[in-house]
């Protein structure tokens, strides 16, 4: 983890890095490694990609063990083949308003993701995509045999759209906070980021938190009951300690993780909260990192890597963060 010991590199030849990832000397000048990319965890030994202007951001001085690869101030963003300046806002599609900040893009949905439970006034609510409309709209299908006009008996009607107001005015500052991005790893420890100007100076800043959707070693499919296709939120396992690059959380946590599906759907966090976790490293150093904790999960077909990058982003976000 640090460079105090002698150089020891794996015997095999230099690693093969994925396309677009630089092969660089580790931070100790010892071994050739694949450079860490934007938003990934980095250490003294695991450097960030210098060819992309990334550096290892450790946060507070107490956290000098493990950081997050961050773009230098003012770094532009490449999104959908277009280059955006840091601080520039753009509408990536009719559904999302995005902001570039130091190489990271944060997007906020412009369409409402509100839910509608059945009621006498709307017995069979459905969200439908209407021709010429960007956002899906609520439709209240009515029973076919209704003739009287009353709360539950109205003719089929297309609902007006509505969007959540994602902004808030505070002391001459239009406060905007993007949703937390999906966790960078589908299992094991990853990173989730967002962009916000919810601070005293109203300046856009990036925030990151650790996240774990599920442990990699868990074989959750075994627990799916016969005839069922998904486990949305498996029973909470025994208390665990989180591990981060050789450091271990000081407390144990009864964390919830998301389950799995066998029918092609994805199971991802739906409601989350952010809490600080203290990690103790082998040399005795203690560092505090914000971490996502899952409250509920949801099963859906909008899986990472779907054709529509925006739909995929939209449904994979962790929203309703309680922090």
């Amino acid at each position: 983890q640090n460079c105090s010991g002698p150089c020891r590199c794996p015997d095999e030849p230099a690693p093969r890095c994925p396309a677009g990832v630089s092969l660089v000397l580790d931070g100790c000048g010892c071994c050739r490694v694949c450079a860490k990319q934007l938003g990934e965890l980095c250490t003294e030994r695991d450097p960030c990609d210098p060819h992309k202007g990334l550096f290892c951001h450790f946060g507070s001085p107490a956290n000098r063990k493990i950081g997050v690869c961050t773009a230098k101030d003012g770094a532009p963003c490449i999104f959908g083949g277009t280059v955006y300046r840091s601080g520039e806002s753009f509408q990536s599609s009719c559904k999302y308003q995005c902001t570039c900040l130091d190489g990271a893009v944060g997007c906020m949905p412009l369409c409402s993701m509100d839910v509608r439970l059945p009621s006498p006034d709307c017995p069979f609510p459905r969200r439908v995509k209407l021709p010429g409309k960007c956002c899906e709209e609520w439709v209240c299908d009515e029973p076919k045999d209704q003739t009287v006009v009353g709360p539950a008996l109205a003719a089929y009607r297309l609902e007006d759209t509505f969007g959540p107001d994602p902004t808030m005015i505070r002391a001459n500052c239009l406060v905007q906070t993007t949703e937390w991005s999906a966790c960078s790893k589908t299992c094991g420890m990853g990173i989730s980021t967002r962009v916000t100007n919810d601070n005293a100076s109203c300046r856009l800043e990036k925030q990151s938190r650790l996240c774990m959707v599920r442990p990699c070693e868990a074989d959750l499919e075994e627990n799916i009951k016969k005839g069922k296709k998904c486990i949305r939120t498996p029973k909470i396992s025994k208390p665990i300690k989180f591990e981060l690059s050789g450091c271990t959380s000081m407390k144990t946590y009864r964390a919830k993780f998301c389950g799995v599906c066998t029918d092609g759907r994805c199971c991802t966090p739906h409601r989350t909260t952010t809490l600080p976790v203290e990690f103790k490293c082998p040399d005795g150093e203690v560092m505090k990192k914000n971490m996502m904790f899952i409250k509920t999960c949801a099963c859906h077909y909008n899986c990472p890597g779907d054709n529509d990058i925006f739909e995929s982003l939209y449904y994979r976000k962790m929203y309703g963060d309680m922090a």
Epitope: D114, S119, D121, C122, F162, P164
Partner: antibody, heavy 114, light 110 residues
Framework: EVTLKESGPVLVKPTETLTLTCTVS????????VHWIRQPPGKALEWLAV???????DYNAAFMSRLTISKDTSKSQVVLTMTNMDPVDTATYYC????????WGQGTTVTVSS | ETVVTQEPSLTVSPGGTVTLTCRSS?????????ANWVQQKPGQAFRGLIG???NRAPWTPARFSGSLLGGKAALTLSGVQPEDEAEYYC?????????FGGGTKLTVLG
């Protein structure tokens, strides 16, 4: 973010009329109805009235002659008026969104006393 | 006058299963009553858990399920957590009006 907020007088004299306003955000009153519910101290919830998404109304029969519910969709406000108030009407009054009563306001406490 | 009746109080151990019921004084509860279940935790606002008999709100954990059981509306909690300790109200629709039950105080032991 969906929110509902009740406002109105804290103290009402007997025989007076109570006017309560529910201001909503994060959804449209042309898409969702809004209910009024109350809870007297130490007692259960009591449903009072609803204004549906298309403007139709329904009332608790026990209060029908005293209640009027209306809305101003452009202002995102629902108004409930209750006439001839009595000390037994002392309660916390809530508005809630139609569709599983999913979202509620924090409530406004009304005391009826001379 | 239609009366909706709930168990005044129920006690359950963590990890256990408990069923809260909602009875109508004028006959069996059906899907036309659009049974709703509302939760209030101490010091918090009310929030809907279940609407239209069995449909969960997005924040409602999977351990909560709504159904019709023996002519009554039912809310079943499987694998009860300490944070489920709360007051639970059901509401039934009767063509022109809703009626709320008296509420069930659920206590989670330990």
């Amino acid at each position: 973010e969906v929110t509902l907020k009740e406002s109105g007088p804290v103290l009402v004299k007997p025989t007076e009329t109570l006017t309560l306003t529910c201001t909503v955000s994060g959804f449209s009153l042309s898409t969702f109805g809004v209910h009024w519910i109350r809870q007297p101290p130490g007692k259960a919830l009591e449903w009072l009235a609803v204004i549906w998404r298309r403007g139709g109304t329904d009332y608790n029969a026990a209060f029908m002659s005293r209640l009027t519910i209306s809305k101003d969709t452009s202002k995102s406000q629902v108004v409930l008026t209750m006439t001839n108030m009595d000390p037994v009407d002392t309660a916390t009054y809530y508005c809630a969104r139609d569709g599983g009563f999913d979202y509620w306001g924090q409530g406004t406490t009304v005391t009826v006393s001379s | 006058e239609t009366v909706v009746t709930q168990e005044p109080s129920l006690t359950v151990s963590p990890g256990g299963t408990v069923t809260l019921t909602c009875r109508s004084s004028i006959g069996a509860v059906t899907t036309s009553n659009y049974a709703n279940w509302v939760q209030q935790k101490p010091g918090q606002a009310f929030r809907g858990l279940i609407g239209g008999t069995s449909n969960r709100a997005p924040w409602t954990p999977a351990r909560f399920s709504g159904s019709l059981l023996g002519g009554k509306a039912a809310l079943t909690l499987s694998g009860v957590q300490p944070e489920d300790e709360a007051e639970y109200y059901c509401a039934l629709w009767y063509s022109t009006h809703y009626v709320f039950g008296g509420g069930t105080k659920l206590t989670v032991l330990g």
